[in-house]
Amino acid sequence: KAMHVAQPAVVLANSRGTASFVCEYASPGKATEVRVTVLRQADSQVTEVCAATYMMGNELTFLDDSICTGTSSGNQVNLTIQGLRAMDTGLYICKVELMYPPPYYMGIGNGTQIYVIDPEPCPDSD
């Protein structure tokens, strides 16, 4: 009854500092409520980037001030992280928790290395 989570190894953010990736999980049970958390790991320190709980069949709802948005389809979650800068380059881990009904199950992906390159400033025009 293992809970496996898959996510891409590498993603490149676009010029506007937006990165998207899919987090897919193999559910050992029939969960009706799922929580998805994006964690950033840097130098063995782990911090929460964003989190959302959703009912199966419904949309993910992140907090209004979250830098994440997402959609769900079955056991697949499409995550988008916005407002990234070069200093935010790092390993972003997808954690999936089956919250209800019990028993609780948890799965963690191996992480997606997100590379962010700050855009070059536009040259002054005479």
Partner: antibody, heavy 119, light 108 residues
Framework: QVQLVESGGGVVQPGRSLRLSCAAS????????MHWVRQAPGKGLEWVAV????????DYADSVKGRITISRDNSKNTLYLQMNSLRAEDTAVYYC????????????WGQGTLVTVSS | EIVLTQSPGTLSLSPGERATLSCRAS???????LAWYQQKPGQAPRLLIY???SRATGIPDRFSGSGSGTDFTLTISRLEPEDFAVYYC?????????FGPGTKVDIK
């Protein structure tokens, strides 16, 4: 720094009730699952209960189901354990513990509060 | 429920020696969701290892964890006087979250 401080333990007669509290500080309380773990005198560790994030989802060990209720007040950064119909076998040190971000292992523990059930 | 068994029950060693503690699960622990704790008399437990092999913050590198599936090991490469304590393993892949009965490491 992360701090967890339990209170509410004491001596109570069998069949009576007791409420334990755990005051948390030094972290964003609502982002973590919070647990109670107990240890009977001279025995090993036993997980008792967990309450997740916003407090809607909870889970219990079979040994306490129906007699113990876990709750939290995120506005007060406080975790609770309501213990009813207490038995002698509930005698233990009760620890409040924070679940880790990478899973429900216990990365910070309180100092524990002793509950003694005796007539 | 996943039942964890620890061996040996007691390990008698001298400072400077290597300690090898075993934790065996009744069924596979998904994705190595296993933790190790140290507990000294009168104190709360302290997290040493999570994810079977990741050291917790501030834990000396003489502590290492390994294993997967049903067999896990905690190794203390060179015992320091402060390492004599009881060690517990715990699985956290699914509820109920269970502990092993503990291994006591005492001074020979």
């Amino acid at each position: 720094q992360v701090q967890l401080v339990e209170s509410g333990g004491g001596v109570v007669q069998p069949g009576r009730s007791l409420r334990l509290s755990c005051a948390a500080s030094g972290f964003t309380f609502s982002s973590y699952g919070m647990h109670w773990v107990r240890q009977a005198p001279g025995k090993g560790l036993e997980w008792v209960a967990v309450i997740w994030y916003d407090g809607r989802n909870k889970d219990y060990a079979d040994s306490v189901k129906g007699r113990i209720t876990i709750s939290r007040d995120n506005s007060k950064n406080t975790l609770y354990l309501q213990m009813n119909s207490l038995r002698a076998e509930d005698t233990a040190v009760y620890y409040c513990a924070r679940g880790g971000l990478l899973g429900p292992y216990f990365d910070y523990w309180g100092q524990g509060t002793l509950v003694t059930v005796s007539s | 429920e996943i039942v964890l068994t620890q061996s040996p029950g007691t390990l008698s060693l001298s400072p400077g020696e290597r300690a090898t503690l075993s934790c065996r699960a009744s069924q596979s622990v998904s994705s190595s969701y296993l933790a190790w704790y140290q507990q000294k008399p009168g104190q709360a437990p302290r997290l040493l290892i999570y994810g079977a092999s990741s050291r917790a913050t501030g834990i000396p590198d003489r502590f290492s964890g390994s294993g997967s599936g049903t067999d896990f090991t905690l190794t203390i490469s060179r015992l320091e006087p402060e390492d004599f304590a009881v060690y517990y393993c715990q699985q956290y892949g699914s509820s109920p979250f269970t502990f092993g009965p503990g291994t006591k490491v005492d001074i020979k």
